[in-house]
Amino acid sequence: GCINITSSASQEGTRLNLICTVWHKKEEAEGFVVFLCKDRSGDCSPETSLKQLRLKRDPGIDGVGEISSQLMFTISQVTPLHSGTYQCCARSQKSGIRLQGHFFSILFTETGNYTVTGLKQRQHLEFSHNEGTLS
């Protein structure tokens, strides 16, 4: 089977959502946990993560073979404390398989804005913290 993990971000007003999406087959979900780490280059684990989520075994419908499960970590107001390097990971507690997504960063600037860099598929986002809009 093939399990795929991607990272993305979205902004809602002053909130920043960091999203880890895992695509997997129904039968591959059992025992899998997806988690988001900050500033953990080597020891990213569910125990040291900001948030974790068990993969769903049921896509809700029967006519599909692949499921997407989404972990969303919401930062209500980005501050300098949120600057750092983030990574989406997944691990099977059953088989020991480990997946690591690309590193991405939040950079808080002196002007009160922040940027999210390192996201794939045109996901380099630059946000204005004060205005709450894409800049």
Epitope: K26, L53, R54, K56, D58, G60, D62, G63, S69, Q70
Partner: antibody
Framework: QVQLVQSGAEVKKPGASVKVSCKAS????????MQWIRQAPGQGLEWIGA????????RVTQKFRGRATLTADKSTSTAYMELSSLRSEDTAVYYC??????????????WGQGTTLTVSS | EIVLTQSPATLSLSPGERATLSCRAS??????LHWYQQKPGQAPRLLIK???QSISGIPARFSGSGSGTDFTLTISSLEPEDFAVYFC?????????FGGGTKVEIK
Amino acid sequence: QVQLVQSGAEVKKPGASVKVSCKASGYTFSDFWMQWIRQAPGQGLEWIGAIYPGDDDARVTQKFRGRATLTADKSTSTAYMELSSLRSEDTAVYYCARRGIAAVVGGFDYWGQGTTLTVSS
Amino acid sequence: EIVLTQSPATLSLSPGERATLSCRASQSISNHLHWYQQKPGQAPRLLIKYASQSISGIPARFSGSGSGTDFTLTISSLEPEDFAVYFCQQSNSWPLTFGGGTKVEIK
């Protein structure tokens, strides 16, 4: 044993909103899709949408998109369905129902008792 | 959206008779179809899962068949408590949908 207990009957005016709750017990709430279905007086069953409490993945049918909001509180094992901009045609019994294990049951194996919503000026 | 068409809308039969209810899907849904029974003032009850699989606690006189687009619910010998409304529902794709229902009434 699995139980779904819904909130009581509601009477609302056109344009108002309503929030119906469905408290689940007897199973792992976050592992099963919760459905919302309604039935107007003398009519058939109409699927509104579903939510997976494990990751808050929610699906709402086109007709109710923008008007129905599905949420779930894992700490209390309670699912909610909020319907806004109510009109008289929304008068119906609203049910929550659990989708059974995929490929094993698949259908809606447990149902709430129903919540009657009356929209009238 | 998959449309499920149930026929007939009403079936008038006597106790002891055989009831045959039909559900037709607007496109192929494999065996991803379920049947429910609903009595007045009650929530629906799951009768048959995945077109033909029985449910624990449901009498053996209820059976289902079909695959693809055409499905049938059969009640081999109607009991007084079987007079109710029957709905089919597909779980093949979003949005999930129900058929319009068939009312089985006493002749």
